[in-house]
Every structure is written in structure tokens, then in C-alpha cells.
Interface confidence: low
């Protein structure tokens, strides 16, 4: 969890002299608690926005959006602690709008934003925004949460975000599977624009998909500088055992920019449906998934089996 | 020039906490796992834990699992690890360690000693 | 979990002798194995990745070699500065186990 890297951040508006200030997310008001507080936050809002770096990088970024209740407890109002959790890491960012003037009734709703907290893709996060002076111990809680969803790397807007192209997300290998005779398989990928090394992984499943029989990896070394965009093919010798024959396969690249952590893409070809004229056919039916990143260096184990080649269609 | 400079060791005594810390410099940071490993004295290497670029993935070895976490701050190029329950065989040079694409570890910081001891 | 042994513990040889070691894994980890060279009071090096290639800057007489379950380090023509202790480590899942370790001294 970040701030994004540029510009002052502001929070002034008219009628309203505000300064945005870094916060440890323990505000004074809750060590030494006031008698009179401000009523809670309301139509808190959270929407996914994008927003460029001086260095021309472009984020993913919580905009986060709220209104205050048309009370006299504005009166009290000296600020808001905006904070946000990243739920799977328990990790917390926290900034501060200290108001430096009194704010005053005036005909329209008095309405805050800020746009600076970058998020990560595919990350759950809770945006909480607390007026304060925080409340007394007991009093009325005066905050409002929101949980926000980032869309994953598959999403239109986020697959051109900085940290999405970093993983990966522009390449579509566009992998396609085909069963031959002799208990073999057949995957095809396109390669991408990069001299890259690339881990092709098969995982045997039995038809019920609970029960691994067969794992195997198989690497391509880095393609030369005219392989880039041709497809490569790795056959993969599979179980004998007739019932092993629901199979998951990734394909990993070591893209520079993501090395270890890259988008993986896999498809999953289920078990044939046994019919009295069973042929070796390419697979039509198998399913694309988008694999999540994934702490490489975890690979599967070889033990040896199966044969490997792959060769470039030019 | 590729760096990384452990700190935060020192003399604990069993059931205490410590946080190692590791920065990182002369490198993309946020594009690399990360591994902890250690050394008792006169022994070998030990891996201890190991932590993907975004923190999506992360292993312990058994003898540290529930006791230590790893985590990291790719925006201050820094790597850590809050050892909590510390025990005598805790005791040993922790090294925080970058893996190389295509396997193994290619950059080691210098060290960072625990020692555990009533 | 997979276990690394390493043989032997130490050895003893001769300046510009052939060393080998040896490195073994319970079961099968393809060519996912690294070696490494740990001088006394230094931080470990990589040596050897993916079973057999050498890192840059690591001088030519030193080799890997096997695939699987069986794997070597070979010494062309040991020198004073390889006095040290030799790591082999699998890659392939978690735990990323380190083997024990052979002491290599000259005699």
C-alpha cells in the first residue's frame, strides 16, 4: 500500500482551509478523548480510478468519495482520518485532512474526495473514513466502512495499469491443446516479444478431479530475437492409467519485468467423453483460465517423465 | 551495485520477538522474491522462508512455521522478518537472499546474527 | 518433504586433483538444483543453476552435472582458493532445502 507519487496533496475547497497529512492511523482523539464530536460520515463512495506518475506510470487508485451530514456537529468537525486495509495482508495506510479553519453552514453539502491511495489488482481492500476528533469511549461510532474489489489483470482498464503490463497482461498466448495417439499431448502457445524463458506445467488429474495422478514441467529456453510472436509447441508423454485424463496446463514466462511473479495462463482439458468411436482430436473445449501471479521457484516436480521438444513454426 | 544489507539482530532472550530487516538497492526490488535463510553456528544452510514479488505467495520451513513472518515493502526496497516464540536453536546468522530466474540464489546480503539465550 | 543428502561430509585433496561431490534427493526434482560455495565467515555464492550451468564470474573448473534424483559437482583441478564448504539446494517446490554440506580442504 502506497500513495501515489505526485503532485501536493489538497484538500482545500472553498470555504474550507485543509492540509493533508501523513497519519500513523492512531489519531490524538483516541488517546485523549474530547467531549463534543462530529456525527459520522455520509454516502461514503469508492470507486476504482487510474492515475499517472510524474514519471508517466499509470496506477490503479481508490478514489474515495464522501459527504458530511447536515448537523450542527460540523461545528466540531477539525478533520477526517481516510484508512485502507489491504484484507489479505492486514496492511494499513492511513492519511490525514487536518482542517485548519472552522467549517461553516452554507447552502450546499459539504462533499470530500481524495484519489491517492494506489491499489493492487485482484486486491480486497476496507476503505474506513473517521471524522474527528474520534469519539468517545462508548459514544456513537462516527465512521463508515466500505469493502472495495479490485478488478484482476483481466479487466480492459487494468490490463494497460503499470503493474499489470509488468506481469504480463498484454501477451495472449493464445494456448491451444491436442490429444495425440500414444498418450500424448500437444500444447501450442504464442511466444511474446521477449528473449525469455517460458515453464510449460501439466497436472494429471482423475476424471472426478480429486485426485492428482501425473505431474510434469517442461521448460523453453528463451527464443531468439525472430521467434518472437511464433508459436511453441511442447509434447508432453502422459499417464498410462486411462483414468488420469483430466489435465490442467500453465504456461509460465520469466519476463523481465516480473520475473518469478509473472501472469501465468492456463487452460484445463477435461476427460473425454467415451463413446464407441473414440478418435485423438484437438481439443475444442478446454477452458481458459487466468492464472493468478504466483511465487515461482514452486515448480512442479519432473521426476523424469515424459518427453520434451519444442520447435517454432515460422 | 546489486546489495542487500540485513540488520535487527541481536541478543533475545527464549519466548522474545525480533524483527529482521533487509534493504535491498541496485536492483528492481519489487520484481523479485525474496528468501530468508539461516546458519546455526558451525552448521549449514537453512532455508527459512520465502516470499513472491507482491507477497501472494509465501512458504515457512516447518521449524519456523507460526513463529516468524515473512513480509515486504517494495515501495522502501525492503525485505523482513518478525520472529516471534524465539528459542534456543533460533540462534544462527540469518542471510536474506535474492533468487535468480532459472533457480538458486544469486545475491546475498551479509548477514544479520541472533542470538537466543537466557 | 524431500530430503538432500550430500557425500561425502568432507575430503581432503591435493592441489590441481579432481573433486567430485555428490549430491542426492528422495525423489526426483528434474534439473531443479543449485550449488553453492560458502568460505569461512563468508556468505554463501552460487556456483551452479539448473543442475549444470555455470553463474557468471565462477571460474571454468568448476561443473554440475545429473538430473532427477542424482546430481554432482565436479572440481576440475582443485585450487587453495576452493578451501570451503560446498551447499547443494532443490529449487523445484517449497521447502527449498539445502543438502548439508561437504567440507573441501587441501592436504
Known amino acids: 500500500l502506497r500513495l501515489l507519487d505526485h503532485r501536493a496533496l489538497v484538500c482545500s475547497q472553498p470555504g474550507l482551509n485543509c492540509t493533508v497529512k501523513n497519519s500513523t492511523c492512531l489519531d490524538d482523539s483516541w488517546i485523549h478523548p474530547r467531549n463534543l464530536t462530529p456525527s459520522s460520515p455520509k454516502d461514503l463512495q469508492i470507486q476504482l480510478h487510474f492515475a499517472h506518475t510524474q514519471q508517466g506510470d499509470l496506477f490503479p487508485v481508490a478514489h474515495i468519495e464522501w459527504t458530511l451530514q447536515t448537523d450542527a456537529s460540523i461545528l466540531y468537525l477539525e478533520g477526517a482520518e481516510l484508512s485502507v486495509l489491504q484484507l489479505n495482508t492486514n496492511e494499513r495506510l492511513c492519511v490525514k485532512f487536518q482542517f485548519l479553519s472552522m467549517l461553516q453552514h452554507h447552502r450546499k453539502r459539504w462533499r470530500f474526495s481524495f484519489s491517492h491511495f494506489v491499489v493492487d489488482p485482484g486486491q480486497e481492500y476496507e476503505v474506513t473514513v473517521h471524522h474527528l476528533p474520534k469519539p468517545i469511549p462508548d459514544g456513537d461510532p462516527n465512521h463508515q466502512s466500505k469493502n472495495f474489489l479490485v478488478p484482476d489483470c483481466e479487466h480492459a482498464r487494468m490490463k494497460v495499469t503499470t503493474p499489470c503490463m509488468s506481469s504480463g497482461s498484454l501477451w495472449d498466448p493464445n494456448i491451444t491443446v491436442e490429444t495425440l495417439e500414444a498418450h500424448q499431448l500437444r500444447v501450442s502457445f504464442t511466444l511474446w516479444n521477449e528473449s525469455t524463458p517460458y515453464q510449460v506445467l501439466l497436472e494429471s488429474f482423475s476424471d472426478s478431479e480429486n485426485h492428482s495422478c501425473f505431474d510434469v514441467v517442461k521448460q523453453i529456453f528463451a527464443p531468439r530475437q525472430e521467434e518472437f510472436h511464433q508459436r511453441a509447441n511442447v509434447t508432453f508423454t502422459l499417464s498410462k492409467f486411462h483414468w488420469c485424463c483430466h489435465h490442467h496446463v500453465q504456461v509460465q514466462p520469466f519476463f523481465s519485468s516480473c520475473l518469478n511473479d509473472c501472469l501465468r495462463h492456463a487452460v484445463t482439458v477435461p476427460c473425454p467423453v467415451i463413446s464407441n468411436t473414440t478418435v485423438p482430436k484437438p481439443v475444442a473445449d478446454y477452458i481458459p483460465l487466468w492464472e493468478p501471479r504466483s511465487g515461482s521457484s514452486d515448480y512442479k516436480d519432473d521426476d523424469d517423465k515424459g518427453s520434451s521438444h519444442h520447435h517454432h513454426h515460422h | 551495485e546489486v546489495q542487500l544489507v540485513e540488520s535487527g539482530g541481536g541478543l533475545v532472550q527464549p519466548g522474545g520477538s525480533l524483527r529482521l530487516s533487509c534493504a535491498a538497492s541496485g536492483f528492481t526490488f519489487s520484481s523479485y522474491s525474496m528468501n530468508w535463510v539461516r546458519q546455526a553456528p558451525g552448521k549449514g544452510l537453512e532455508w527459512v522462508s520465502f516470499?513472491?514479488?507482491?507477497?501472494?505467495?509465501?512458504y515457512y520451513a516447518d521449524s519456523v512455521k507460526g513463529r516468524f513472518t515473512i513480509s515486504r515493502d517494495n515501495a522502501k526496497n525492503s525485505l523482513y522478518l518478525q520472529m516471534n516464540s524465539l528459542r534456543d536453536e533460533d540462534t544462527a546468522v540469518y542471510y536474506c537472499?535474492?533468487?535468480?530466474?532459472?533457480?538458486?540464489?544469486?545475491?546475498w546480503g551479509q548477514g544479520t546474527t541472533v542470538t537466543v539465550s537466557s | 518433504d524431500i530430503q538432500m543428502t550430500q557425500s561425502p561430509s568432507s575430503l581432503s585433496a591435493s592441489v590441481g586433483d579432481r573433486v567430485t561431490i555428490t549430491c542426492r534427493a528422495s525423489?526426483?526434482?528434474?534439473?531443479?538444483l543449485a550449488w553453492y560455495q560458502q568460505k569461512p565467515g563468508k556468505f554463501p555464492e552460487l556456483l551452479i543453476y539448473?543442475?549444470?550451468t555455470l553463474q557468471s564470474g565462477v571460474p571454468s573448473r568448476f561443473s554440475g552435472s545429473g538430473s532427477g534424483t542424482d546430481f554432482t559437482l565436479t572440481i576440475s583441478s582443485l585450487q587453495p582458493e576452493d578451501v570451503a564448504t560446498y551447499y547443494c539446494?532443490?529449487?523445484?517446490?517449497?521447502?527449498?532445502?539445502f543438502g548439508p554440506g561437504t567440507k573441501v580442504d587441501i592436504k
Open positions: 539448473a543442475a549444470s
Open positions: 525423489q526426483g526434482i528434474s534439473n531443479y
Open positions: 537472499a535474492r533468487p535468480k530466474v532459472g533457480g538458486g540464489m544469486d545475491v
Open positions: 539446494q532443490k529449487y523445484n517446490r517449497a521447502p527449498f532445502t
Open positions: 516470499i513472491s514479488a507482491r507477497s501472494s505467495t509465501i
